[in-house]
């Protein structure tokens, strides 16, 4: 399973070495869900770096939920020695790297990049602005990271991404962060945009960890996750500058079902945290 091979780096405390997650969902907060059952389950706590017990309501929630302590450990923990070593893994290119350049049916003349399987290099092309295919990147760097081989014939990064064919916004399938990329910001910046379960359509921003940008999305008004900001600036402040941030233990606050903006005092500076 390619997910097994990929690791995710989050630094959550100044005293601790970089945390490498085997699966991105290990970074999700424990989510009891909206139902009212009382079920003992386990989740991986990125702050204590341990699997811990929580009470699950019986429906919805997220993937950071395990029937047993052993299952949680198996999915989310590794010995520290493995965690600290950066690994460059031989990985397959995503299938879309082998698609031919496709300008799409519109004519907007946007400069984009595609991986040319003949030359084995990323090259510039004129994109029409709509449709086309997934071999289509906003930057040369993005194209190289995803489709070109590294110096030893290794795949540099395999993001496991889904490219919206028109927005050409890379949306992580399971928010995989490339194994060579040390993200020092809040863990929720690595989670995918989550609309939530209600019916509103509020304009919000989320941090897309694959392309390193804050992107708009529509929030339903309830549920979702903490990768949810009312402005682009707020999103950038919390996630884009994550390369220099360290989070003290206990940085997240869990409140019941209300999503209100709260200021959380953190050791190094104030950042905004969204609560479920």
């Amino acid at each position: 399973d390619s997910e097994e091979d990929e690791e995710h780096t989050i630094i959550t405390d100044t005293e601790l070495p970089p945390l490498k997650l085997m699966h991105s969902f290990c970074a999700f907060k424990a989510d009891d869900g909206p139902c009212k059952a009382i079920m003992k389950r386990f989740f991986f706590n990125i702050f204590t770096r341990q699997c811990e017990e929580f009470i699950y309501g019986g429906c919805e929630g997220n993937q950071n939920r395990f029937e047993s302590l052993e299952e949680c450990k198996k999915m989310c923990t590794r010995d520290n020695a493995n965690r600290i070593i950066k690994t460059t893994l031989q990985q397959e290119k995503p299938d879309f790297c082998f698609l031919e350049e496709d300008p799409g049916i519109c004519r907007g003349y946007i400069t984009r990049y595609f991986y040319n399987n003949q030359t084995k290099q990323c090259e510039r092309f004129k994109y029409g602005g709509c449709l086309g295919n997934m071999n289509n990147f906003e930057t040369l760097e993005e194209c190289k990271n995803i489709c070109e081989d590294g110096p030893n014939g290794f795949q540099v990064d395999n993001y496991g991404t889904q490219l919206n064919a028109v927005n050409n916004s890379l949306t992580p399938q399971s928010t995989k962060v490339p194994s060579l990329f040390e993200f020092h910001g809040p863990s929720w910046c690595l989670t995918p945009a989550d609309r939530g379960l209600c019916r509103a359509n509020e304009n919000r921003f989320y941090y897309n960890s694959v392309i390193g940008k804050c992107r708009p999305f529509k929030y339903s008004g309830c549920g979702g996750n903490e990768n949810n900001f009312t402005s682009k600036q707020e999103c950038l402040r919390a996630c884009k500058k994550g390369f220099i941030q360290r989070i003290s233990k206990g940085g997240l606050i869990k409140t019941k079902r209300k999503r209100k903006k709260q200021r959380v005092k953190i050791a190094y500076e104030e950042i905004f945290v969204k609560n479920m």
Partner: antibody, heavy 123, light 112 residues
Framework: QVQLQQSGPGLVKPSQTLSLTCAIS??????????WSWIRQSPGRGLEWLGI?????????DYAVSVKSRITINPDTSKNQFSLQLNSVTPEDTAVYYC?????????????WGQGTLVTVSS | DIVMTQSPLSLPVTPGEPASISCRSS???????????LNWYLQKPGQSPQLLIY???NRASGVPDRFSGSGSGTDFTLKISRVEAEDVGVYYC?????????FGQGTKVEIK
Amino acid sequence: QVQLQQSGPGLVKPSQTLSLTCAISGDSVSSNSAAWSWIRQSPGRGLEWLGIIYKRSKWYNDYAVSVKSRITINPDTSKNQFSLQLNSVTPEDTAVYYCARWDSDKHWGFDYWGQGTLVTVSS
Amino acid sequence: DIVMTQSPLSLPVTPGEPASISCRSSQSLVFSDGNTYLNWYLQKPGQSPQLLIYKGSNRASGVPDRFSGSGSGTDFTLKISRVEAEDVGVYYCQQYDSYPLTFGQGTKVEIK
């Protein structure tokens, strides 16, 4: 003024091939500012896009997954037309079939449509 | 596939009165440059569809200014400021954000 004139049989037997042609006047099938599509309409499915072809530096096509294994859309530059072939038809393929021009420059939409051809799949 | 959901499916109208049709997409249709990848079509009885509104809010050539399109993200609206008898037919929204191109199920506008 662009015009699209459709032709082809209205009755096709199950398992056979549905073939329709769309003759273009007022534009060129090789134009790099247009794309050419087939869309069908049936009471059960509403408007269903089937596929599209377009010429840029070369010819491109895209097909709906639902018909991808059975469909071919081809340009005929000498006659300035394009055709639809749908293989192994079943009664489910009974519909009104439209050809349409996608305006790649201004509208980014289907701005001209053929008159429609009702195709019935029945033995 | 992106699912386009229109409401209402049937809209009885009075000539001279305004009318509004809603279209909701299962994912956002807004591109990073601000373009909205949504079109509106009208299919009059016995005719082929015709393009009314492109890129979410632009009227196609020859379309009267009583028609207007608005919305962004996943929620879009087609408004007719004062309905005329010739406006009857079925209205469809269509997305071109990703393949396959998909249409709404249609809203039938008829005179009361």
